[in-house]
């Protein structure tokens, strides 16, 4: 039996700049029941506070609701582990909510096979920004990637589309079924997870419909 090992703050992420969650990895428990507490202060302020909500985001996490989230402040966050034999504290993590945004994936992915005047076939991929994103006001600007692969292929083909919410994919094989996903990233943040997979079959004898 021994004091607990040093915990490590794994990451902090915000879906929308309005709330955020931090997760930690506990160290060894020293063979004893161990309690974990997350404390934080804001740069330039004296007070230290305890995590407002240990439940919402699951085990080894702390959820900061709107009430506890400020975007123009740097949070200094530590996790403390305590058991009967002693305690240990993580290295502090400095968090600026503006820089930890990981949004929801784009929504309303639609796939349509189309044809140019020269009979060249392409797949027209369109989507919408994630629901919480207020793109128009500049609160968020999102960049996007799409990925696709034929059902038989092992590797995804990735296309960066910038701020555009549509993309035309050329040189596809007729008769093949393609899987497509999209993801997005705000200016200073992280890529979302890949969104829901959609599939479409490229017809063998595609003819333009009026």
């Amino acid at each position: 039996q021994s004091p607990p090992g040093k915990p490590e703050i794994h990451k902090c992420r915000s879906p929308d700049k309005e709330t955020f969650t931090c997760w930690w990895n506990p160290g060894s428990d020293g063979g004893l029941p161990t309690n974990y507490s997350l404390t934080y202060s804001k740069e330039g302020e004296k007070n230290t506070y305890e995590c407002p909500d240990y439940k919402t985001s699951g085990p080894n996490s702390c959820f900061f609701s709107k009430q506890y989230t400020s975007i123009w402040k740097i949070y200094i966050i530590t996790v403390n582990a305590t058991n009967e034999m002693g305690s240990s504290t993580s290295d502090p993590l400095y968090v600026d909510v503006t820089y930890i945004v990981e949004p929801e994936p784009p929504r309303n992915l639609t796939l349509e096979v189309k044809q140019l005047k020269d009979k060249k076939t392409y797949l027209w991929v369109k989507w919408l920004p994630p629901t919480i994103t207020d793109v128009k006001t500049g609160w968020f600007t999102m960049e996007y990637e799409i990925r696709l692969k034929s059902e038989e292929a092992d590797e995804w083909e990735i296309h960066f589309t910038g701020h555009q919410t549509q993309f035309k994919v050329f040189d596809l094989y007729p008769g093949q079924k393609y899987l497509v996903q999209t993801r997005c990233k705000p200016d200073h943040g992280y890529w979302s997870r890949w969104g829901q997979e959609k599939s479409i079959e490229i017809p063998n004898d595609f003819t333009l419909k009026d």
Partner: antibody
Amino acid sequence: EVQLQQSGPELVKPGASVKISCKASGYTFTDYNIHWVKQSHGKSLEWIGYIYPNNDGTGYNQKFKSKATLTVDNSSSTAYMEVRSLTSEDSAVYYCARGDGNYVGDMDYWGQGTSVTVSS
Amino acid sequence: DIQMTQSPASLSASVGETVTITCRASENIYSYLAWYQQKQGKPPQLLVYNAKTLAEGVPSRFSGGGSGTQFSLKINSLQPEDFGSYYCQHHYATPFTFGSGTKLEIK
């Protein structure tokens, strides 16, 4: 015919700012990205950033993030780049270019360039 | 950032000859490569995008090839108007970067 017409040459003092314009014609302005590229005398090309007029989305080369600001005025189909805190290192020809309508990063039409000279 | 290494830095050739310029990306950029031609005092002009697609109005003596990290631009039967500087540029994801250029001169 697609055209990008840039503003004239600038001679500016160190520490000052300059705002270059790029007026687009011959296509739907909001459908295409506008890129900005720097070319120092006798050197290669450096991508500064781009703006998508449809939603004012921007992407910057980190090197220029605190140096340049990209904006658009959709009513006049004009893109602008402001370069601030100028030093001799900023003396260069600056180009605006239209991004291909599908592939974001290749630039199919270019402005004639705006020469910026920083000198006291 | 993805680095683009272009070679040679300069080359001399005669009208009618065939020349090849190469470009190497520091990581996989699939087929996201463009080639530009630039004449003295003028803006660059797009020649090729997506590694091998000729831009509108570009003569068929120009051809692009390669994918992944190795790319080339081939000019068959050089014409007097082909002399100038050539740049490769990846357009895979931001930041987009250019090669250092190849100056093609008349021998």
